[in-house]
């Protein structure tokens, strides 16, 4: 069966800037700003467009070791991103894939709304585990807020037509120091 879960969440970050950081450069940004949630993102095949396969690895202590995502659509004009979780994590005997749609919509106050749709494609009559839906939502929220905190702390980042560089994330300006990681992410 197919089980659809839709959520909306707001952000103070303008839609174009959030799309650049959260969607287009998430692979680079997530392990830097949320290492407690994602340890690495590896491009298996493709150049970021439809058909691209990515392997997202999780740090020790989380329920799953990795997932593989397939990019289905990247719409730069409408700030829309569709992808599917096709391997690893919860995918297995009872779950075939999870199709995800993220649309970032500008709001009149200069912020944005993220409209998220998660379709769980189960095998046969199997239902979706509530814990899985909750964990997935929490992961998304963690990543979004970590990216927001970075963008609020670095006024220039992703404001122009450039993605963040290693240099921008390094030195005194990196968001999370080793000391901070020790204090805040390994309690």
């Amino acid at each position: 069966g197919v089980f659809n879960y839709e959520t909306e969440t707001t952000s103070v970050i303008p839609a174009a800037r959030l799309f650049k950081a959260f969607i287009l450069d998430g692979d680079n940004l997530f392990p830097k700003v949320a290492p407690q949630a994602i340890s690495s993102v590896e491009n298996i095949e493709g150049n970021g467009g439809p058909g691209t396969i990515k392997k997202i690895s999780f740090p020790e202590g989380l329920p799953f070791k990795y997932v593989k995502d397939r990019v289905d659509e990247v719409d730069h004009t409408n700030f829309k991103y569709n992808y599917a979780v096709i391997e690893g994590g919860p995918i297995g005997d009872t779950l075939e894939k999870i199709s995800n749609e993220i649309k970032i919509v500008a709001t009149p106050d200069g912020g944005s709304i993220l409209k998220i749709s998660n379709k769980y494609h189960t095998k046969g009559d199997h239902e979706v585990k509530a814990e899985q839906v909750k964990a997935s939502k929490e992961m998304g929220e963690t990543l979004l807020r970590a990216v927001e905190s970075y963008l609020l702390a670095h006024s220039d980042a992703y404001n122009e037509q450039k993605l963040i560089s290693e240099e921008d994330l390094g030195g005194e300006q990196k968001l999370i120091s080793e000391e901070d990681l020790h204090h805040h992410h390994h309690h």
């Epitope: 905190s149 702390a153 670095h154």
Partner: antibody, heavy 118, light 107 residues
Framework: QLQLQESGPGLVRPSETLSLTCTVS??????????WGWIRQPPGKGLEWIGS???????YYNPSLKSRVTISADTSKDQFSLKLRSVTAADTAVYYC??????????WGQGTTVTVSS | DIQMTQSPSSVSASVGDRVTITCRAS??????LVWYQQKPGKVPKLLIY???SLQSGVPLRFSGSGSGTDFTLTISSLQPEDFATYYC?????????FGQGTRLEIK
């Protein structure tokens, strides 16, 4: 209306730890829209940023104070706190807590005077 | 770190005068500059953000300009309540840094 209020001892002995708390009312420190911070001003001198915290616990500190500073947050109480270790007379100042919107300090507490003296 | 330098450190002026205070950043900060006013024994008050945007409630005689490394705060016609110390602050990224302040005194 958002209000911030600093609290803590007004006198700290040299080499001890200065501890201050900022209580936020009329708003929530759990908002993902803002950072929160501590700033100080020694008598007759300018403003010095000490450090800032995001509701998730991520922190930034002034490099010159980093080895002595810890800022933490208690979202359940809408409070964030400052600890400054191994204080000397040079740490005597008015200490302010503030809300940061896009890195501008748009709401400040009234400030609390901390004197370091034996 | 980005260093902020204000000039002059103090200035004497009379009511009705036009006063300009400058602030220089040690590296480009685009328009990420903030100005504050502080009166003796009082809390700093946000005047201008993003180099030229007036904070709500701030009188129109205050204006800001500049981009990159050089910025100015202008008071077009000084009022008695404007005598205070003014600070600039870069809002590009942490660590936040302030200018040393400019004290505006009555001549």
């Amino acid at each position: 209306q958002l209000q911030l209020q600093e609290s803590g001892p007004g006198l700290v002995r040299p080499s001890e730890t200065l501890s201050l708390t900022c209580t936020v009312s009329g708003g929530s420190i759990s908002s993902s829209n803002y950072w929160w911070g501590w700033i100080r001003q020694p008598p007759g001198k300018g403003l010095e940023w000490i450090g800032s915290i995001y509701y998730s616990g991520i922190t930034y500190y002034n490099p010159s104070l980093k080895s002595r500073v810890t800022i933490s947050a208690d979202t359940s109480k809408d409070q964030f706190s400052l600890k400054l270790r191994s204080v000397t007379a040079a740490d005597t100042a008015v200490y302010y807590c503030a809300k940061l919107e896009w890195l501008r300090l748009d709401f400040w507490g009234q400030g609390t005077t901390v004197t370091v003296s034996s | 770190d980005i260093q902020m330098t204000q000039s002059p450190s103090s200035v004497s002026a009379s009511v009705g005068d036009r006063v300009t205070i400058t602030c220089r950043a040690s590296q480009g900060i685009s328009s990420w500059l903030v100005w504050y006013q502080q009166k003796p024994g009082k809390v700093p008050k946000l005047l201008i953000y993003a180099a030229s945007s007036l904070q709500s409630g701030v009188p129109l005689r205050f204006s800001g300009s500049g981009s990159g490394t050089d910025f100015t705060l202008t008071i077009s016609s000084l009022q008695p309540e404007d005598f205070a110390t003014y600070y600039c602050q870069q809002a590009k990224s942490f660590p936040l840094t302030f200018g040393q302040g400019t004290r505006l005194e009555i001549k």
